[in-house]
């Protein structure tokens, strides 16, 4: 375990002073819920003989509407909160004048993240406390002093799961066009172990880094017409909930076993990713279950191996790729990582190399489309928050959407005294308005049966005393006596 190891340092970097372009004028007295970070922002960076102009937009789809944070309180009890009305400072966008460019940055305390121009991936981070106008380092990933990291998923296991791999099955698509299908959504639950917490030092620092990482992963997946939305964050600020071993395969098994036990009382999610400060044995930085997305084994473990969060973001994108059925690029004869990027630079390369990858190869995209043809992949079809991702909330449509606490239909039809039908907010004194664990506007006490067993493999569910809805339907794993 290496929670005290120093972060890797840059070997070579340029110093830049970002300049924020003046945006549209806004009134000085902003309502407090709008926060300090504008919806859109542009910066000019003078780097590598160019002036790069970054046009950024706040990633409004970063957090699901029911996003929760779980940690251990000072008294030792586990606390799950649903932070409300939080502003954030995580942005995505492009570089002016470069058609296939991409950018993913946080602006919370200076600029930190990446921007991609042609075949160059530039990383940026603050050098001092001077905020967004202060001194920043701009550098390329190969100038980080770090060793190459590898994926622990073995080629043998991939072969048995994915079958023969030849280029014949891969139909290259012209240019970088998005797959012509509905956007898919990965509802992601991130667990941060105690070693990582110790390394970062506070819940706030962990939250910041995780949001930064997920913002980057989401940006990498957007080219595949995927969105990655964080629905839950669990920080082991007191102690680990299971043994995090330097052997990544052991840690993954422990994660999946733990997740199966916790699933009924934790947020609904499609995929769980552990970020650990433990140094995995050898050069391995990640390990995943292949083609497990949407199943009880949907998850992976990731070592936070680089000073810049883009490092662990690339690892997470890679391991999530395995969850989505992707193989290592080297294993596929004729696999093409777009011509303008040299070999080994794509996300599903078996080794992360010294330069962080920034795109998926043709064969990764084909594996993904093949996985999406399976009935198993249906969990990716639902937008995590209907109201936000596919249109504004409508009070009175029976769907409890962003900003609503209840929805009992139009005022003339509503017969629910717990819900104010004109505002879709709870009536005065009401704790709840919907759900099998809601009775007469109050949450039922813990232990009350809310879903009986359907058959011998099913498990009965009980109200938890905190939520108006019955926990997710759980069942015994096959082979359980």
């Amino acid at each position: 375990i290496a929670p005290s190891r120093p972060w890797a340092l840059m070997e070579q970097y340029e110093v830049v002073l970002p300049w924020r372009l003046p945006g549209p004028r806004v009134r000085r007295a902003l309502p407090s819920h709008l926060g300090l970070h504008p919806e859109r922002v542009s910066y000019v960076l003078g780097a590598t003989g160019h002036n790069f102009t970054l046009h950024l937009r706040k990633n409004r789809d970063l957090l699901g509407s029911g996003y929760t944070e779980t940690y251990t309180a000072a008294n030792g009890s586990e606390v799950t909160e649903q932070p409300r009305g939080q502003d954030h400072c995580f942005y995505q966008g492009h570089v002016e004048g470069y058609p296939d460019s991409a950018a993913s940055l946080s602006t919370c305390a200076g600029l930190r993240g990446f921007f991609q121009v042609g075949s160059d991936l530039h990383l940026i981070e603050p050098l001092d406390e001077g905020g967004e106008g202060g001194r920043h380092a701009v550098y390329q990933a190969e100038h980080l002093l770090q060793t190459a990291g590898t994926c622990g998923v073995s080629d043998d296991s991939l072969g048995s799961l994915l079958g023969p791999r030849t280029a014949a099955v891969f139909r290259p698509r012209p240019g970088d066009s998005l797959p012509s299908r509905e956007t898919r959504y990965v509802e992601l639950y991130v667990v941060v172990d105690n070693a990582e917490f110790q390394m970062l030092g506070s819940e706030a620092a962990v939250r910041h880094r995780v949001l930064e990482v997920v913002n980057h992963v989401d940006k990498l997946y957007q080219k595949l017409n995927f969105r990655v939305v964080l629905v839950g964050l669990e920080i082991w600020n007191s102690q680990d909930r299971f043994h995090v071993s330097p052997d990544p395969s052991v840690t993954l098994e422990n994660l999946l076993t733990w997740q199966a036990r916790q699933r009924t009382r934790r947020h609904l999610h499609d995929n769980v990713q552990l970020i650990t400060g433990v140094d995995f044995t050898g050069t391995t930085v990640g390990f995943a279950r292949v083609s497990a997305m949407c199943s009880h084994s949907s998850g992976a473990v990731n070592q936070d191996h680089s000073k810049n969060p883009v490092g662990v973001a690339c690892t997470m994108a890679h391991e999530m790729g395995h969850n989505l059925g992707m193989d290592h690029d080297e294993n596929v004869q004729g696999c093409r990582c777009q011509e303008r990027f040299e070999a080994g630079r794509c996300i599903m390369a078996g080794s992360i190399g010294s330069s962080f990858p920034r795109m998926f190869s043709d064969c990764s995209q084909a594996y993904l489309e093949s996985f999406l043809e399976r009935p198993q992949s249906v969990c990716l079809a639902n937008a995590p928050d209907l109201s936000h991702l596919v249109g504004g909330p409508v009070c009175g449509n029976l769907f409890v959407e962003r900003g609503e606490q209840c929805d009992c239909g139009p005022p003339e039809d509503c017969r629910n005294r717990c819900c104010n039908s004109t505002t879709c907010q709870l009536a005065e004194g009401a704790q709840c308005a919907h759900g099998t664990c809601c009775q007469e506007c109050k949450v039922k006490p813990a232990g009350e049966l809310c879903r009986p067993k359907k058959d011998m493999c099913d498990l009965e569910e009980f109200c938890d005393g905190r939520h108006p809805e019955c926990p997710e339907d759980a069942f015994q794993e096959n082979g359980t006596p």
């Epitope: 639902n382 928050d385 009175g396 029976l398 759900g435 809805e469």
Partner: nanobody, 118 residues
């Protein structure tokens, strides 16, 4: 995981009718509500109509379809229908069936295309 499958889309003349079906893989009574959304090219998906699936049936509609569209359900077939009459060219869109069983969480189908020609 719940699966919703839409069918019944197609080409219709202005003033004509279509009936969309949404078949659920499980019992629709396990949901709080089932609804239809639609999305025309280049626009955000908009809510069209919903139906409560247990207790007294409530059927709200977006103003633009009131009096023309009717949402209904058949609990025995685990299916929700959208009867669309007096169709207009502006009703052209992909129609999605969505279901909700808990706050801030919905399942949606893959959609069915409806094209209304003038």
């Amino acid at each position: 995981e719940v699966q919703l499958v839409e069918s019944g889309g197609g080409l219709a003349q202005a003033g004509g009718s279509l009936r969309l079906s949404c078949a659920a893989s499980g019992s629709i009574t396990s949901f709080n509500a089932v609804g239809w959304w639609r999305q025309a090219p280049g626009t955000q998906r908009e809510w069209v109509a919903s139906i409560s699936t247990s207790g007294s049936t409530i059927t709200p509609y977006v103003d633009s379809v009131k009096g023309r569209f009717t949402i209904s359900k058949d609990n025995t077939k685990n299916t929700v229908y959208l009867q669309m009459n007096s169709l207009k060219p502006e009703d052209t869109a992909v129609y999605y069936c969505c279901a909700t069983e808990r706050m801030h969480h919905s399942y949606c189908g893959q959609g069915t295309q409806v094209t209304v020609s003038s």
